[in-house]
């Protein structure tokens, strides 16, 4: 059945018999309706990836710089399946490429000029492209050739492979620059000995190099890694201080009409037939006609990459900077240590507008980015696509976990002057009920809830924590009759109360009427009989102070919160009755646009911030009468963090642990694709 | 509630030239912020250029250098020239003042700009 069928596509002689093999033994263990392989021969790993977005093949495994070209338009193809290494149980997927230098040195990355360099080779991931390529705005111009530029950038290198008569002093560290292990600074092993021996200043190789090289701790501890943010770490710490996150091997597919599943199912299927020590007749990872057919001879075996997971998610941010900065050639005409315009991202069109009104006030200080999720929000964040917003802490978790740090704090409490310096302790994520319904903590089963939105803070994290921890299972649409909680499947009974308009229904936007804070409590007054949201959320909408139709005629009184013990209690007692203290919403941003971000908008909401008293003829940053656009509107000031500026750090040990025991019923895409 | 109201669009060869106007029903004066947007077929609406009071502009980087917004607080209104026009300048083009609720999704008629040879 042609549907069923996989064209793997090979490379050469070798690869297409392994490949016929390959076919032949799947055959011989699948059922006939189940997935089979067609091979189809091309002369390169490019003639592939043509092939393919031709759809005339339908997979090939690539290294990284290959997973690159796959993705550039417009081949447009991505990561469905990776290889790993190691054990089962600590699979390994990606490598990181890592500076490596001596302990009593004191440089830091940003003041590499005039040092003496020890790479791993000419032209190879860790050892060059990857250096070189976060390097390459800061080398001396001309920057082409390419080599003359690194050679007057430091003051002496070892590139083994790399011309010595053209390039002497890329060689000045191995005469010769012998591109074999007869040069004993060549490779991975041999640029750690170059640095060790004291001929270079820094290293770059593999994060695994120093491990393999030095089994002592106490001698892995003369060593340390240089960070991005010119800070250094314990050669231990590489998954938080290393130059790109670097994926092994990668078997890619198209985009659209990709087959992804059958490509998992088929090389699923085989890795428990010809994995590692499965089968004499027919091995997935090695082969008699020569080195790395098809996949790696290291690998041990596959695993499915997340759906949410494009190629610029997959490579990483720094890894696609290094590579596009080496392929293109290009650099920004600003010196980099200047700051260029922050692009925030807005939630759908409502929030573009405020965030155009504001980019028009800033004279372009700000840009604006949009997405339809604050999911893909975050996302754009990470790829380079967009620089900050802000969130709400549960999208302050997924965020941390995806590589972002916090930057600024929303404060509610705190007046001016005092607002920028001083770190509040949160708010309250309370239970709002009807003063006339009989409803307690105690009894909420089978009734209509409304949620702010899946997977914030207080409208989800926090009661659905509670909650499970009461019934052990994730079922909430079960639990209650039938709810609004953006974000849900959209044939989820927790879609059921949503108000839309249709194309949005259930959308985590403000397209969605029921969303957010203000849209939660409005799906209470409508249709609900419980929502959960600040401790604010009542107040700020009741006694006339919003002016929209439904709610202009609300009664303060007419509400009550629930209370953990089965009692109620006045709104005006949150802090006697709530479900739990809540993080503030914070900006966060890509460390490397940290910085930028808090020196922007301290100096944003100077001039927009709640100093401003007329926000009828004024741009103001924090009203959007009451539709919480961009920051909350009960936002007085963004606060610096001090010591507070990771994720973890910035929510507390209690609140994520708390999240991370919800993650079992995790319904976050990219939460998956972060943690992959 | 200003009622804004565009027109000077047209047919126009590409490289030739256009003026938008924005009538406002009322006073602009104490408007902070206007601006025009455009929407092509199957597009996104997208912000072309903004104006403050204090005078202070933002382009879209594609129009930059081609086009200038400016205001004329004493006739009430708002203007858009736009020079070099090209293909994919194609839209209608829109003047909003963002004195109304983000959220309320008013929007005028437009104005219709096709840039062909």
């Known amino acids: 059945v042609p549907e069923k069928s996989v064209r793997w596509c090979a490379v050469s002689e070798h690869e297409a018999t392994k490949c016929q093999s390959f076919r032949d033994h799947m055959k011989s263990v699948l059922p006939s309706n189940g997935p089979s392989v067609a091979c189809v021969k091309k002369a390169s790993h490019l003639d592939c990836i043509r092939a393919i977005a031709a759809n005339e093949a339908d997979a090939v495994t690539l290294d990284a710089g290959l997973v690159y070209d796959a993705y550039l338009a417009p081949n447009n193809l991505k990561p469905v399946v990776a290889e790993f290494y190691g054990s089962k149980e600590d699979p390994q997927t990606f490598y990181y490429a890592v500076a490596v230098v001596k302990k009593d040195s004191d440089f830091q990355m940003n003041q590499l000029r005039g040092r003496k360099s020890c790479h791993t080779g000419l032209g190879r991931s860790a050892g060059w492209n990857i250096p070189i390529g976060l390097l390459y705005c800061d080398l001396p111009e001309p920057r082409k050739p390419l080599e003359k530029a690194v050679a007057n950038f430091f003051s002496g290198s070892c590139v083994p492979c790399a011309d010595g008569t053209d390039f002497p002093q890329l060689c000045q560290l191995c005469p010769g620059c012998g591109c074999s292990t007869l040069n004993q600074y060549f490779s991975y092993s041999g640029a750690f000995k170059c640095l060790k021996d004291g001929a270079g200043d820094v290293a770059f190789v593999k994060h695994s190099t120093i491990f393999e090289n030095l089994a002592n701790k106490a001698d892995r501890d003369q060593y340390e890694l240089l960070c991005l943010d010119n800070t250094r770490k314990s050669v231990d710490e590489y998954k938080d201080c290393h130059l790109a996150r670097v994926p092994s091997h990668t078997v890619v597919a198209r985009s659209v009409g990709g087959k992804e599943d059958l490509i998992w199912e088929l090389l699923n299927q085989a890795q428990e037939h010809f994995g590692k020590d499965k089968s004499k007749e027919f091995q997935l990872f090695s082969s008699p006609h020569g080195k790395d057919l098809l996949f790696k001879d290291s690998a041990h075996g596959f695993l499915k990459v997340p759906p949410r997971m494009d190629a610029k998610m997959y490579l990483g941010y720094e890894y696609i900077t290094a590579i596009r900065n080496l392929r293109e050639g290009t650099c920004p005409e600003a010196p980099t240590d200047e700051c260029k315009p922050v692009k925030w991202c807005a939630l759908s069109h409502h929030e573009r507008l405020k965030c155009d009104e504001w980019s028009v006030n800033s004279a372009g200080k700000i840009e604006c980015e949009s997405a339809e999720t604050t999911e893909d929000c975050i996302a754009k964040i990470m790829n380079g696509e967009a620089d900050a917003m802000s969130l709400d802490g549960g999208f302050v978790y997924i965020a941390g976990m995806c590589g972002l740090v916090p930057v600024l704090a929303e404060n509610y409490n705190t007046p001016n002057p005092n607002c920028e310096n001083t770190a509040e302790e949160g708010y309250f994520a309370v239970a709002v009920v009807k003063s006339s319904s009989d409803l307690t903590w105690d009894n909420l089963k089978g009734k209509k809830s409304c949620h702010t939105a899946v997977g914030r803070t207080a409208g989800w994290n926090i009661p659905m924590g509670l909650l499970y921890s009461k019934i052990n299972h994730c079922r909430f649409d079960e639990f209650f009759s039938e709810g609004c909680a953006p974000g849900s499947e959209k044939n989820s009974s927790l879609c059921k109360l949503c108000m839309g308009p249709s194309p949005n229904l259930c959308e985590p936007n403000n397209k969605e009427g029921y969303y957010g804070y203000t849209g939660a409590f409005r799906c209470l007054v409508e249709k609900g009989d419980v929502a959960f949201v600040k401790h604010q959320t009542v107040p700020q909408n009741t006694g006339g102070k919003n002016p929209d139709a439904w709610a202009k005629n609300l009664k303060e009184e007419d509400y009550e919160l629930l209370c953990l013990d089965g009692s109620r209690k006045s709104v005006q007692e949150p802090a006697n009755c709530h479900l739990a203290r809540a993080p503030n919403h914070a900006v966060v941003a890509r460390k490397d646009k940290a910085d930028c971000v808090q020196t922007l908008l301290l100096d944003q909401q100077r001039m927009f911030g709640s100093s401003v008293t007329d926000c009828s003829s004024n741009f103001c940053l924090f009203e959007s009468k009451t539709k919480d656009l961009l920051f909350r509107d009960d936002t007085v000031c963004l606060a610096k963090l001090h010591d507070r500026n990771t994720y973890e750090k910035y929510l507390g040990e209690e609140y994520v642990k708390a999240v991370t025991n919800l993650r079992k019923c995790s319904t976050s895409p990219l939460l998956e694709a972060c943690t992959f | 509630e200003v009622q804004l109201v565009e027109c000077g669009g047209g047919l126009v060869q590409p490289g030739g030239s256009l003026r938008l106007s924005c009538a406002a029903s009322?006073?602009?004066?104490?408007?902070?912020?206007m601006a025009w947007y455009r929407q092509a077929p199957g597009q996104q609406r997208e912000l072309v250029a903004g104006?403050?009071?204090?005078?202070?502009?933002k382009y879209a980087d594609s129009v930059k250098g081609r086009f200038t917004i400016s205001r004329d607080n004493a006739k009430n209104t708002l203007y858009l020239q736009m020079n070099s026009l090209k293909p994919e300048d194609t839209a209608v083009y829109y003047c909003?003042?963002?004195?109304?609720?983000?959220?309320?999704?008013?929007w005028g008629q437009g104005t219709q700009v096709t840039v062909s040879s």
């Open positions: 009322g006073s602009i004066a104490s408007i902070n912020t």
């Open positions: 104006i403050t009071r204090g005078g202070s502009t």
């Open positions: 909003t003042d963002f004195s109304r609720d983000y959220y309320q999704d008013y």
